[in-house]
Each structure stands twice: as structure tokens, then as C-alpha cells.
């Protein structure tokens, strides 16, 4: 492929080295005032400036108070562990004026047998052990406390739960003579919630359980259990909701069948079938009841588990998710993409769109990407003219008392947003693609042709003139 241009998307760099300032000491919660963004949409810049100056005047202006970091807390109950037996934990940044809590589940694939777990332990140990976790993490995207980066929930209490159980947040088995590794993902979530109750969560109005990739699937698997846990512990007034980003996978047929040797080559159904046994994985009770014993793996797939969930869940999913394409053995690099691959990719987009038809709250741009909500560019992507933070805000508003029973969005405030154009990056607001050598941004037509997209063939397929197709692509229609 020498001489061919290559493309690169922004984002996905390793986090910066951790900073280690001390976190502010906890104080008494203060009631926050609600901010209604609808009133200021015409002049968001001046609104942001007002918010910023208000925030600065309300805070004692010490560097310590304005510290952006989330601080590590290892679980006090050390029997709830990462794969290697080290204690699990969470990163917390309290916002004492807020009764909103955001709990974010990290992603990072999984392992499903001793061999690939051993290999993961020697390569990605931070995803299996807490031994080397930094003392602090910086919140980005939906975890940011900056209104510019997070116009949705910047003032919330932020909790980042590192993924160290390799079980798609489903496991409930401890390390023993027989088990070389513990798989306690589901128990880690329960224990974090229990500990947070003593740190202010008890006064919460809304708990949003969010996650990306394997963490997004983890949301679907655990959101009802968290709601049930809080009810049992005597906190029925806390509204539990879910936000599943890039975790809505399809158990479809691979483009090219491959043996289930390694995590990223293994067909989704094969991997989860094996994993659920190896992890002693738990699935939501109502979903489990729908499938016979041994068929619980079905509940790891969004479109099967979603109809059984009681808690409201907002689904964010790229129509052309890179992780889905990876497990389906579609690799959009190197050689020009063959016609068979294009048909497969288009069909994937169609299938995914179909599974979101009955999902009340969704945001599904026609982009080739993976994960979005903790990326700093999460505010930039739009579907039908609405950004993700705006759609989440509209979803939030649908729960306000006057709209309690309402399942339909208010006029001008949509939250079921699924792209209908058929190709990767046919949405012009997709994360930027740049030519690797020149650094120039590419438009969608350049990108698609660059990947071997045959305009003649596709135009014929769609029953239109090649020139018309090119025009459509360039305009992102």
C-alpha cells in the first residue's frame, strides 16, 4: 500500500501523565439550581461566559478547589477485586452543589479463557489489576467539569470506575485455587454504589450509569440491578438511568468466518458464550427468564436485553462501529475495500438502524468510529441537526414532572436520533478524517474513494447517476 494516502481520526491518544494534587475535602451538600438550556440556545457563548463567571465567583478561587481531577479510592471491601486479586476501586470528583451522580464504566474488550487472560495480564495489566493505577485521572467529555466541554452535566458528581475484571462487567466469581483470576465486574459496581452512598450518593436525585464499549454493554447488564440495589437499601427516590455508548453489538454473521482464537478475531456469540461460563457471568433477571438455561449469552446483545429493562436507557451507537467491524472481520485498511465488504458494511448500518427503531432514546450517527462520550469532541457530532449533549438534555427534560408519562419528545427537543444515510461518514459532522501525510481534512467523498470506494458500482447499485452520488457524498446527504 506504499504511496497510497492513509487516514487518521482525531482522538484516542493515551491519557496525559496523571497529576497528583490533593482533592478538595468533602463538605455538606448544598442544593443546586436547575439551568434550563433551552432559553439560551440563541446565544450559547454569552450564556457560557455567564456560567463561567458565576462558577468562578461562587468558588473560593484556590487552585485546590478548581482542581479538575478525579481522585482514586480503592474499595474498602478488599474482597471485591480485580482479576488478579488486587482491590477494585473508583475515581471520584464530588460536586457538592449537585444531586446528580454520573457513574462511568470504562471499556476495554474482555478475555474468555486462561490463555488470552494470561496474555492480557502481561500486556494490559491495568485492565486486570489496580496495582499501577494513578492516584488521579482527568475527567474528559461527559466526565468533564468544564461547561464548554460538557454542556450536559458539567456540575454533576463524577465517578470513573476503571475496568479491571475483563468480563464485560458481568462476573461474580472470586479468585481461588481453581480460578486463576477473579471475575467480579457486576460485584464491583454494586460495591462502588454501596461505598458512594456514604459519600453523598444517598442524597442523589438522579444516578446515571454510563459506559463506553464493554462499559456500554455493562450498563445494559447492570442498570436494573443498581436500581434494585438502591431500592433494597432504602433509596427508592433515586432515579436510576443508563447511558450505553458503543456497547450495542449485533450477534451477526462475520464477513469472513474465523476461528475463536483471540479476543478480536472471535465472533461475538462465540466469545460471549465462552466468556459467560468462564466468568460465571450474571445477566439481568428479566432477560434471563426469557432465555432457557445456557442461552443467557443472548442478554449481552442490546437489542435482546433492552426490551426487558425497567430503567430508562439512552443508547449511543455509531452505525459503523469499529469494534463491531473488527469482530466481524471487516478491516478497512490496506487494500481497497472490495464490493462484498461495502455491501456487508451498508447492511450492518441497516441492521443496526433496525434494532434501534424501538429504542426511545438514541443517538446513532453514520460514522466509522468507536466510543464517544468521554472524548473531548463529543459535543461536535450531530444527527439531524442535534448534538449528543442536547439530545441528552432533551431526554432529561422528558422526565420532569409535567412530562412524567410522556414518551414522546417535546417539540424542538428530540432524543431519538438515528442517521438514515447509508455509508460511513455520510454525516458531515462525523469525527474529522485527516490525510496522514498532509494533515489536510478530507471530505467524505475523498475518504470513501480513498478507501477504494467504486463510485460507478455503488451508483449503479443505488440506481442513480455517478455525478449525483458524488454530489450527495460531498454534501453529506
Amino acid at each position: 500500500s506504499e504511496g497510497r494516502k492513509t487516514w487518521r481520526r482525531r482522538g484516542q491518544q493515551p491519557p496525559p501523565p496523571p497529576r497528583t494534587e490533593a482533592a478538595p475535602a468533602a463538605g455538606q451538600p448544598v442544593e443546586s439550581f436547575p439551568l434550563d438550556f433551552t432559553a439560551v440556545e440563541g446565544n450559547m457563548d454569552s450564556f457560557m461566559a455567564q456560567v463561567k463567571s458565576l462558577a468562578q465567583s461562587l468558588y473560593p478561587c484556590s487552585a485546590q478547589q478548581l482542581n479538575e481531577d478525579l481522585r482514586l479510592h480503592l474499595l474498602l471491601n478488599t474482597s471485591v477485586t480485580c482479576n488478579d486479586g488486587s482491590p477494585a476501586g473508583y475515581y471520584l470528583k464530588e460536586s457538592r452543589g449537585s444531586r446528580r451522580w454520573l457513574l462511568f464504566l470504562e471499556g476495554g474488550w474482555y478475555c474468555f479463557n486462561r490463555e488470552n487472560c494470561d496474555s492480557r495480564y502481561d500486556t494490559m495489566r491495568r485492565l486486570m489489576s489496580s496495582r499501577d493505577w494513578p492516584r488521579t485521572r482527568t475527567g474528559t467529555g461527559i466526565l468533564s467539569s468544564q461547561p464548554e466541554e460538557n454542556p450536559y452535566w458539567w456540575n454533576a458528581n463524577m465517578v470513573f470506575i476503571p475496568y479491571c475484571s475483563s468480563d464485560v462487567w458481568s462476573g461474580a466469581s472470586s479468585k481461588s485455587e481453581k480460578n486463576e483470576y477473579a471475575f467480579m465486574g457486576a460485584l464491583i459496581i454494586q460495591e462502588v454504589v454501596r461505598e458512594l452512598l456514604g459519600r453523598g450518593l444517598s442524597g442523589a436525585k438522579v444516578l446515571l450509569l454510563a459506559g463506553s464499549s464493554a462499559g456500554g454493554t455493562g450498563v445494559l447488564l447492570n442498570v436494573d440491578r443498581v436500581a434494585e440495589q438502591l431500592e433494597k437499601l432504602g433509596y427508592p427516590a433515586i432515579q436510576v438511568r443508563g447511558l450505553a455508548d458503543s456497547g450495542w453489538f449485533l450477534d451477526n454473521k462475520q464477513y469472513r468466518r474465523s476461528d475463536c482464537i483471540d479476543t478480536i478475531n472471535c465472533a461475538p456469540t462465540d466469545a460471549i458464550r465462552r466468556g459467560i461460563r468462564y466468568w460465571s457471568g450474571m445477566v439481568p433477571e428479566r432477560c434471563q427468564r426469557q432465555f432457557k438455561e445456557g442461552e443467557e449469552w443472548n442478554c449481552f446483545f442490546g437489542y435482546k436485553v433492552y426490551p426487558t429493562l425497567r430503567c430508562p436507557v439512552f443508547v449511543v451507537q455509531w452505525l459503523f462501529d469499529e469494534a463491531q467491524l473488527t469482530v466481524d472481520n471487516v478491516h478497512l485498511t490496506g487494500q481497497p475495500v472490495q464490493e462484498g465488504q461495502w455491501l456487508y458494511i451498508q447492511n450492518l448500518g441497516r441492521e443496526l438502524r433496525g434494532t434501534l427503531k424501538d429504542v426511545q432514546a438514541s443517538f446513532a450517527p453514520a460514522c466509522l468510529s468507536h466510543e464517544i462520550i468521554i472524548r473531548s469532541y463529543w459535543t461536535d457530532v450531530q444527527v439531524k441537526g442535534t448534538s449528543l449533549p442536547r439530545a441528552l438534555h432533551c431526554w432529561d427534560r422528558s422526565f420532569h414532572d409535567s412530562h412524567k408519562a410522556s414518551k414522546t419528545p417535546m417539540k424542538g427537543c428530540p432524543f431519538h436520533l438515528v442517521d438514515s444515510c447509508p455509508w460511513p461518514h455520510c454525516n458531515p459532522s462525523c469525527p474529522t478524517i485527516r490525510d496522514q501525510f498532509t494533515g489536510q481534512e478530507m471530505n467524505v467523498a475523498q475518504f470513501l474513494m480513498h478507501m477504494g470506494f467504486d463510485v460507478q458500482t455503488v451508483a449503479q447499485q443505488q440506481g442513480m447517476e455517478p455525478s449525483k452520488l458524488l454530489g450527495m457524498l460531498s454534501n453529506g446527504n
Epitope: 484516542q12 491518544q13 493515551p14 491519557p15 470504562e106 471499556g107 476495554g108 474488550w109 486462561r114 490463555e115 494470561d118 496474555s119 495480564y121 502481561d122 500486556t123 494490559m124 495489566r125 491495568r126 485492565l127 499501577d132 475496568y163 486463576e180 463506553s212 464499549s213 483471540d262 479476543t263 478480536i264 478475531n265 469499529e322 469494534a323 473488527t326 478491516h331 485498511t333 468507536h370 466510543e371 468521554i374
Partner: antibody, heavy 119, light 111 residues
Framework: EVQLVESGGGLVKPGGSLKLSCAAS????????MHWFRQAPEKGLEWVAY????????YYADTVKGRFTISRDNAKNTLSLQMTSLRSEDTAMYYC????????????WGTGTTVTVSS | DIVLTQSPASLAVSLGQRATISCRAS??????????MHWYQQKPGQPPKLLIY???NLESGVPARFSGSGSGTDFTLNIHPVEEEDAATYYC?????????FGSGTKLEIK
Amino acid sequence: EVQLVESGGGLVKPGGSLKLSCAASGFTFSDYGMHWFRQAPEKGLEWVAYISSGSRTVYYADTVKGRFTISRDNAKNTLSLQMTSLRSEDTAMYYCARKHYNGGYFDVWGTGTTVTVSS
Amino acid sequence: DIVLTQSPASLAVSLGQRATISCRASKIVSTSGYSYMHWYQQKPGQPPKLLIYLASNLESGVPARFSGSGSGTDFTLNIHPVEEEDAATYYCQHSRELPPTFGSGTKLEIK
């Protein structure tokens, strides 16, 4: 000082055997997955074998599967590669390398030992 | 196995100029905010030396003129300004799964 030192290379006839060793010092050997690589004259780097930190899992390149055996002794801080049924195409510089457990990159390499298979 | 395609195979750069080496993976090598791609320098008669790990992190002791970028499947090593001692062969390597494969190498010559 963190270091890896290979030994055991030499000249051997096709079909013969050889055992390479790699002595580790300056770090907690049992914490790391270890690998063998080789590099034929004027060629690129080729991965040969891997053994996990706890010795439970081993992987081999298809080109050496069934002929080479990787092992380690964490008490003695040594890594070994037993090579049998050697072929002329196994002629190369052999390196042991430490795999960093938070990234899978090879941050420490030995200086190498030469294996020549020739009649 | 993940195939890494490195380009160009060789490169001649004037002293003080920029050298850019690319590496493309046949599958995505990024997950959870980390890109499992690394860069090494090898001089004749020496073992490889780690320069950049996890796509963009400089190994300690490596001069700041070396930098790495990229995500997903496409990665770049930049050297600027190039110095005499940078004449060597450069390899990319992924660690997303076993086996850990290397690119075929780029030989950098200083003009």
C-alpha cells in the same frame, strides 16, 4: 541495572539441538511476560515464542511450533529456549526481551546470541 | 495475525530536516483510549531500542525530537530535526494480541 544476557548460541548441524538461556537481573522477573525474537542476517525482526509471567501460558510462531520449547525459572531469574530439529532457516541472532505489562512493548532487550545452522 | 505495513522502506533526509515514517495495521490496535503501537530504533550489531510506546509516549532517555502519533490503524513516527546519530532502521510493533508483529522496517539515511 536492568539487564538481560543471552547465552548458548553456536554452530549446529541441520537436525541438531541447542538450548539458549537468558539471565535476567535488576528487576522482578516473575512480574513480566517474556519473549524470544530472532533476526536473520539483513532481515527484519521475527517473534519466536512467549511465556506468561506465571509460566501457565506459552505461544509459539507457526515456524517453530513443535520444535522449540520456551520455559522459565522464576526462582533463578532465567528464561530458556530449547531448540530441536534445527533447520538452516533458523540461522539468526536470537534476542530475549521483557514485555512491559502495561502496554505490551518490549522495553528491555538482551544483546543477542548467534545461532548458525549449517552442514 | 495483524499485519503491519511500514512505509517508506528507505528514506534519505538532510540533517536538520523532518523524517516521517508511517505504519498501518490490518486491524484496529486501539482500545479504551490506548493505542497498542510502539516504535523501535535498531543500529547494525545492536538490539532494538524502544523509542515510543503506546503510540505517542516517549521512552525515558529518548530525545524529544522523536514523536509518535496516530490511532486505530494508522500511526506515524516523526523525527525532527534529524541528527547524524539517527541513521538506523526503525520498526513499528503492535501488542493488541498475540503474536506481537513488527513492520518490515524503514532504513533512515542522513544526507
